[in-house]
């Protein structure tokens, strides 16, 4: 109770009371002091006596404490994908008896839902409400409507507002759990078929067969097939077990194999399902190609005269395919070039670039040439090799080695002498000239003898026909 100070300038004090008069109530000196923050209702009882009659005992005085903020309470809720739910107590509650009775109590939407809308039951359904009255909530006219998107959660924030007494609630957030619904059918996006070798087993690549579904994972997209007309479908790791279903996830993992049997052109009919919706009547085409085999004939040995140029010929190198491929499409690649000379093209003789590719047709035309480069040291016979790779897609590549034999023993039209040097001699008329090693050198005959033993040997020139216009 408020009691005045003894002196005029002394401030009034607050004293707890056991009794008070009607006059004290009338003058506003009896106060209720709220001291427990979370307790919003209270009561006390009185015995009222006037001195005239029997006192009134146990008069109950009930108190409602008005919180500083409107006590708006929220409860999270679930809604099916694309579904709706009425926002009514107990999902949305203003506790206590006082605030819900205020005519001006309204709710403001501070943050609207991202994947849905707050709508009035009978109002326009275009967009979300920005505010609505508590009366509408009580009459169950406000609902949350999910937009049907493939989202698992949504949220919105509300704040209560009592305009007539300038009070508000704290912002209250609602979390909406969206229960997914399998409402989207699977769509076959790619069905290009498969090309493979006859009799082979090959994966059905995801690039050849793919489907999508907005609300199903790849492991839930199931292809169910009928009898393939030219083979069998098996899973990697179980080639002996034929299967009639596989998933997009298995295709993505390269686990679905087609094993070809029978006709070259065929495939299988299939249906596509996500467990809820089925898309029937599809066909996956499997086209098998007969294996093209490359073969290499010819001696694969080239005999070259020292220091000369020799064309490769069909006797040396002759490629063909089981499909009768055009020689222009039989391609050789030089994997490792010659060590003792060079390979070049007759029409594109550039001394710089080494020849890397040539065709069988060019071999037939005699346009691929091997040129032997004379070494500084004499030799009788030398061996070179060329490593080639024959290719003609779609056949498998074939490796080939071309052996080159460079020998003084061979009959060489470009080089009549078998000797390392036999240049002949220029002699002025009536005079003499020295025959030196620069003009006549048969040391290549000793090239096969190991160096340490060469001193034990010598080359003997025996004159079988003497000069007729001079003498040795």
């Amino acid at each position: 109770m408020v009691s005045r100070g003894a002196l005029a300038d002394e401030p009034p004090s607050l004293d707890p009371v056991q009794s008070f008069s009607q006059e004290a109530v009338d003058t506003g000196r009896v106060l209720y002091l709220h001291s427990r923050p979370e307790a919003w209702s209270d009561a006390f009882s009185l015995d009222v006596a006037s001195g005239l009659g029997a006192p009134l005992e146990g008069v109950l005085v009930e108190l409602e404490v008005l919180p500083a903020a409107i006590p708006l309470e929220a409860q999270n809720f679930s809604v099916p994908e694309g579904g709706s739910l009425t926002l009514a107590p107990p999902l949305l509650r203003v506790s206590g008896p006082y605030f819900p009775t205020l005519l001006g109590l309204s709710l403001q939407v501070l943050e609207p839902p991202q994947h849905g809308a707050l709508q009035k039951e009978d109002g326009p359904q275009a967009r979300t409400l920005s505010a609505f009255s508590w009366r509408m909530v009580e009459e169950q006219l406000i609902r949350y409507v999910h937009d049907g998107s493939e989202t698992l959660t949504d949220s919105f924030v509300l704040m209560a507002n009592a305009s007539e007494m300038d009070r508000q609630s704290h912002p209250v957030a609602f979390t909406v759990t969206v229960l997914p619904v399998n409402d989207q059918p699977p769509i076959l996006t790619t069905n290009t078929g498969l090309q493979m070798w006859e009799g082979a087993t090959a994966p059905i690549p995801a690039e050849a067969l793919r489907s999508t579904d907005g609300d199903s994972g790849s492991e839930d997209l199931v292809y169910t097939i009928e009898q393939p007309s030219n083979g069998r479908v098996v899973l990697r790791g179980a080639p002996g077990t034929e299967v009639r279903s596989f998933t997009q996830a298995q295709l993505d993992g390269g686990l679905v194999l087609f094993s070809h049997r029978g006709t070259l052109d065929g495939g299988f009919r299939f249906r596509l399902s996500d467990g809820e919706h089925t898309s029937p009547g599809h066909f996956f085409r499997v086209t098998a190609q007969k294996q093209v085999l490359l073969s290499l004939k010819g001696s694969q040995t080239l005999t070259v005269c020292p220091g000369s140029v020799q064309p490769l010929s069909s006797q040396t190198l002759r490629a063909s395919s089981s499909a009768g491929t055009d020689p222009q499409l039989l391609l050789y690649r030089v994997v490792r070039g010659p060590q003792l000379g060079r390979l070049f093209h007759a029409q594109q003789d550039s001394t710089g670039e080494a020849l890397v590719n040539f065709t069988q047709a060019e071999v037939y035309a005699g346009n691929i040439l091997y040129e032997h480069e004379m070494p500084p040291e004499p030799f009788w016979e030398a061996h070179d090799t060329l490593e080639l790779q024959l290719s003609s897609p779609p056949a498998r590549d074939v490796a080939a080695t071309l052996a080159v034999a460079v020998s003084f023993e061979a009959a060489c039209p470009q080089r009549p002498s078998h000797l390392w040097k036999n240049k002949g001699l220029w002699v002025p008329e009536g005079q003499r000239a020295r025959i030196t090693v620069a003009a006549l050198d048969a040391s290549n005959l000793l090239a096969s003898v190991p160096s340490p033993q060469r001193s034990e040997h010598d080359v003997l020139f025996q004159v079988t026909q003497f000069p007729s216009r001079g003498q040795l």
Epitope: V222, E226, A238, T241, R244, S245, R261, G262, R269
Partner: antibody
Framework: QVQLVQSGPEVKKPGASVKISCKAS????????MHWVKKAPGQGLKWLGW????????TYADDFKGRFTITLDTSARTVYLEISSLRSEDTATYFC??????WGQGTLLTVSS | EIVLTQSPATLSVSPGETVTLSCRAS??????LHWYQQKSGLSPRLLIK???DSISGIPARFSGSGSGTDYTLTINSVEPEDEGIYYC?????????FGQGTKLEIK
């Protein structure tokens, strides 16, 4: 309409061979696999094997590998089940079926000495 | 091979009752499961294919459900002519296999 007609009942001695036929009509024969099922007295259905009617490739259940052979005559639209070295336990009704729905009427094979 | 286990082995019900037959596979069979009814001396009759697809000419009281490894055949308001043995068949991978069967008796 679709029909699978099987050959008539057979009575054979142990050690002999038998060839049961199943003739299809009313659909594209090479579109659907043909299966054989065994139903022995007092027992359930047992899947025996099937043949790919497009490729002619048969597949057998483990219990039926060896003495059982499934073959095909595409021009006659007929599938055959041949059982060699017959035993008394081969006594049963053998059904052919195609694409789940279509079943033959069954062929009763009795193996008895 | 995939093993199919049917339950119960035998079932005795009165006309009008609803019956649920179960078929469990030893691994996922991607709904490649078909239900058959066989009456004594007759060929099996397809009731449901691919787990839940209905068959024309089969009464609507027969329905199928399930996925993965667990499948169910439901017969609503059983009739006396429904007596027989019911088999499930998996057609997912070779060898195809039947369940051991459920015998349905009508009281």
């Amino acid at each position: 309409q679709v029909q699978l007609v099987q050959s008539g009942p057979e009575v054979k001695k142990p050690g002999a061979s038998v060839k049961i036929s199943c003739k299809a009509s009313g659909y594209t024969f090479t579109d659907y696999s043909m299966h054989w099922v065994k139903k022995a007295p007092g027992q359930g259905l047992k899947w025996l094997g099937w043949i790919n009617t497009a490729t002619g490739e048969p597949t057998y259940a483990d219990d039926f590998k060896g003495r059982f052979t499934i073959t095909l005559d595409t021009s006659a639209r007929t599938v055959y089940l041949e059982i060699s070295s017959l035993r008394s336990e081969d006594t049963a009704t053998y059904f052919c079926f195609s694409y789940y729905d279509y079943w033959g009427q069954g062929t009763l094979l009795t193996v008895s000495s | 091979e995939i093993v199919l286990t049917q339950s119960p082995a035998t079932l005795s019900v009165s006309p009008g009752e609803t019956v649920t037959l179960s078929c469990r596979a030893s691994q996922t069979i991607y709904k490649n499961l078909h239900w058959y009814q066989q009456k004594s001396g007759l060929s099996p009759r397809l009731l449901i294919k691919y787990g839940s697809d209905s068959i024309s000419g089969i009464p609507a009281r027969f329905s199928g459900s399930g996925s993965g490894t667990d499948y169910t055949l439901t017969i609503n308001s059983v009739e006396p002519e429904d007596e027989g043995i019911y088999y499930c068949l998996q057609g997912y991978s070779t060898p195809w296999t039947f369940g051991q069967g459920t015998k349905l008796e009508i009281k």
